[in-house]
């Protein structure tokens, strides 16, 4: 071909796989008539006619391009659709008149690879390996041309380093003509690489410029022997009886060694192995003072049969013993005095408090409670609380009941009960005293008696309301060795005028109860009348 030696560089046309390449014949009018042009593809220096233009009309030649070529731009441009990697070649157009001239176009084809897929070596890497071991494999599929791979560790690019880092890359050509790149990173790792993040980056070019895609970050299992073993206790801080305590053995090796936790026996000076759960954790639940002691962990590296011992850890489960009060069951005459003493043991300094049981009122801060000139009202419960102020929730209590000698003491002296004739009435009478009184009724009926506490008794009587009973009322009498006392219940027939709008006419008409604490708390429909307090 004339003038081939000084051919100008071909025009570069860049296009992505699958899109349309526009091949513009760059012959000037002086070089040739564009209405009479032949198009060739050049592959391995062999020209193949692929398209003819005659009088501005285009005609494809039979062959690989037959279905994909068409004319555009009034015949000056040849459009090649569905570009594939195999289309990366030189195309030339040749004008026929006045002189045979040609114009060359270099078609460059590009395809971004898929997201790189990274697979870490699941078997892991021992730190003592003599040569670089496989860390991860990176695969970039279906790119064109072959992308470049760069490996990163903790965000820094890795370079080939003799006996330390080796990157082994290979590629395969798919039937589509696209490339799949596989890159294997091999490295000698150290213990500090256990948390290192590795990823690969694919660099590739498109018509729009240079691009890159990054894989996800991965960490590789790094194996190294245990050098240090230690114990951790949860919760941190002061422990108390009842807590859930976990004693955990930890080691700086990977994989973790086999553990056992043992507790020193002070009498035998031997370490007795404790039963741990499947995770090697010793759970004390609930913790008791007996769990206090010296714990240590032993770890075995079965690869070397080397055994390692942790530093011992002292565990203190703080406790408060049972609280003892003396005297345990005090009895006193009215007007006398009483000293109550509270004792307990603890692993920490104790604080004592005395409280009145009924009211929770603090009577004394300290182990000794002194009561003088005792009245009947002083009888009842006193609670000693022994607590460790530095450990919230660590306390024990003991209740003691004080009995004051005296004749029976009635909950009420008299009361009115609203009733209906011929109904079965349920009456209650309560009395207290020391010794504990017994209660009797002045009418026949079914009576039942129950202890409220050692000094207090409640008697219940079921009786049929008769005209005689309405007339006489009902008396209950409480008696003990020191005397007796009586309460009277007056029965009154209920009628519509006696009912208040908020009275409950359907319940409790037959019930009357009273206690020393809630005066005349009748659930019958009686009207509450002011009544003098009776104290026997």
């Amino acid at each position: 071909v004339p003038g081939e030696a000084e051919q100008p560089a071909p025009e570069l046309v860049e296009v992505e796989v699958g899109s349309t390449a526009l091949l513009k014949c760059g012959l000037s009018q002086s070089q040739g008539n564009l209405s009479h042009v032949d198009w060739f593809s050049v592959h391995k220096e062999k020209r193949t006619l692929i398209f003819r233009v005659r009088q501005g009309q285009g005609q494809s030649e039979p062959g690989e391009y037959e279905q994909r070529l068409s004319l555009q731009d009034r015949g000056a441009t040849l459009a090649l659709t569905q570009v594939t990697p195999q289309d990366e070649r030189i195309f030339l157009c040749q004008g026929k008149r006045p002189r045979s001239q040609e114009y060359r176009i270099q078609l460059r084809v590009y395809k971004a690879p898929e997201e790189p897929n990274i697979q870490v070596n699941p078997l892991g890497i021992p730190v003592n390996s003599k040569e670089p071991e496989e860390v991860a494999t990176c695969v970039g599929r279906n790119g064109y041309p072959i992308p470049q791979v760069i490996w990163y560790k903790n965000g820094r690019p890795l370079k080939e380093e003799k006996n330390r880092v080796h990157i082994q890359s290979s590629q395969t050509v798919e039937s589509s003509g696209l490339y799949t790149l596989q890159s294997i990173l091999k490295a000698q790792l150290v213990k500090e690489d256990k948390d290192a993040q590795f990823y690969c980056e694919l660099n590739y070019r498109l018509p729009s410029g240079n691009h890159m895609k990054e894989s996800r970050e991965v960490t590789v299992p790094v194996f190294y022997p245990t050098e240090k073993v230690w114990l951790e206790v949860e919760p941190v801080g002061m422990l108390k009886e009842g807590d859930r305590v976990e004693i955990r053995c930890l080691a700086d090796g990977n994989p973790p060694p086999h553990f056992s936790i043992s507790k020193g026996n002070p009498s035998t000076r031997e370490a007795e192995e404790e039963t741990t759960n499947d995770n090697g954790v010793l759970v004390l639940e609930p913790a008791r003072k007996e769990h206090s002691g010296r714990y240590e962990c032993q770890a075995w590296n079965l690869d070397t049969m080397i055994s390692l011992l942790s530093e011992p850890q002292e565990l203190l489960v703080n406790y408060v013993s049972d609280v003892r009060v003396s005297p345990a069951a005090p009895e006193r005459q009215e007007g006398s005095s009483l000293t109550l003493t509270c004792e307990a043991e603890s692993s920490q300094d104790l604080e004592f408090q005395w409280l009145r049981e009924e009211t929770d009122q603090v009577l004394e801060r300290g182990p000794v409670l002194q009561l003088h000139d005792l009245k009947r009202e002083a009888g009842g419960g006193y609670r000693c609380v022994a607590s460790v102020p530095s450990i919230p929730g660590l306390n024990r209590t003991q209740l003691v009941k004080l009995a004051i000698f005296g004749p029976p003491w009635m909950a009420f002296k008299e009361r009115k009960v609203w009733v209906k004739e011929n109904m079965v009435l349920n009456l209650s009478c309560e009395a207290s005293g020391h010794p504990r009184p017994t209660i009797s009724w002045n009418v026949n009926g079914t009576a039942s008696e129950g202890d409220q506490d050692p000094q207090r008794v409640l008697s219940t009587l079921n009786v049929l309301v008769t005209p005689e009973l309405l007339e006489t009322g009902v008396e209950c009498t409480a008696s003990n060795d020191l005397g007796k006392n009586t309460s009277i219940l007056f029965l009154e027939l209920v009628n519509l005028t006696t009912l208040t709008p908020d009275s409950n006419t359907t319940t409790g008409l037959s019930t009357s109860t009273a206690s020393p604490h809630t005066r005349a708390n009748s659930t019958s429909t009686e009207r509450k009348l002011p009544e003098p307090e009776s104290r026997g």
């Epitope: 730190v127 003592n128 022997p225 056992s260 192995e273 690869d303 070397t304 049969m305 080397i306 011992l309």
Partner: antibody
């Protein structure tokens, strides 16, 4: 018959390095834990290093940690001890030992030893 | 670290007599789960490498004469040669493997 033959001992200056080798025969070397034990002249025994059968786990006492490295080449049935930053107190006969199949750490087989002298 | 202390440092016994060597550990070597002690005894004859005699404190290594026996548990151990023979002249070492590995300082046994 189990045989362990140490070599590589000699005279070295303080701060210098030396590499000891132990050639093993008469057993499947790659199946056994191996160790080095030393004995200073006229003194007792001191454990120096242990390596697992595959070579992935190594242990040292504090006296040599960071200065000595135990390694093995199972293909060559060889055990090594790389000794760096040597001190006068490292002067000793170094024995290559093999564990046995017990569930406890014992030095069941010993080589004849190689003498290392650290002196200026 | 666990310290191993042997006593006596040297011992002279008549042929046929009993020789007793003690070894004391600074902590218990007993694994309470398997009820075994992490203690071994070695014998080193003059000019030779050491030889394993006993492991687990009382288990004799195969080929070791039955005049050698080991006893003890926890922190106190004993190697006994029931009837001393001329070939028993050696230095004897105890060794713990409960926490890493440490040897006792050795006990020299001679013939009186």
């Amino acid at each position: 018959e189990v045989q362990l033959v140490e070599s590589g001992g000699g005279l070295v200056q303080p701060g210098g390095s030396l590499r000891l080798s132990c050639a093993a025969s008469g057993f499947t070397f790659s199946s056994y834990i191996m160790s080095w034990v030393r004995q200073a002249p006229g003194k007792g025994l001191e454990w120096v290093a242990t390596i697992s059968s595959g070579g992935s786990s190594t242990y040292y006492p504090d006296s040599v940690k960071g200065r000595f490295t135990i390694s093995r080449d199972n293909a060559k049935n060889s055990l090594y001890l790389q000794m760096n930053s040597l001190r006068a107190e490292d002067t000793a006969v170094y024995y290559c030992t093999r564990d046995d199949d017990y569930d406890v750490k014992v030095f069941a087989y010993w080589g004849q030893g190689t003498m290392v002298t650290v002196s200026s | 670290d666990i310290v191993m202390t042997q006593s006596p440092d040297s011992l002279a016994v008549s042929l046929g007599e009993r020789a007793t060597i003690n070894c004391k550990s600074s902590r218990s070597l007993l694994n309470s789960r398997i009820r075994k002690n992490y203690l071994a005894w070695y014998q080193q004859k003059p000019g030779q490498p050491p030889k394993l005699l006993i492991y687990w404190a009382s288990t004799r290594e195969s080929g070791v004469p039955d005049r050698f026996s080991g006893s003890g548990s926890g922190t106190d151990f004993t190697l006994t040669i029931s009837s001393l023979q001329a070939e028993d002249v050696a230095v004897y070492y105890c060794k713990q493997s409960y926490n890493l590995l440490t040897f006792g300082q050795g006990t020299k046994v001679e013939i009186k």
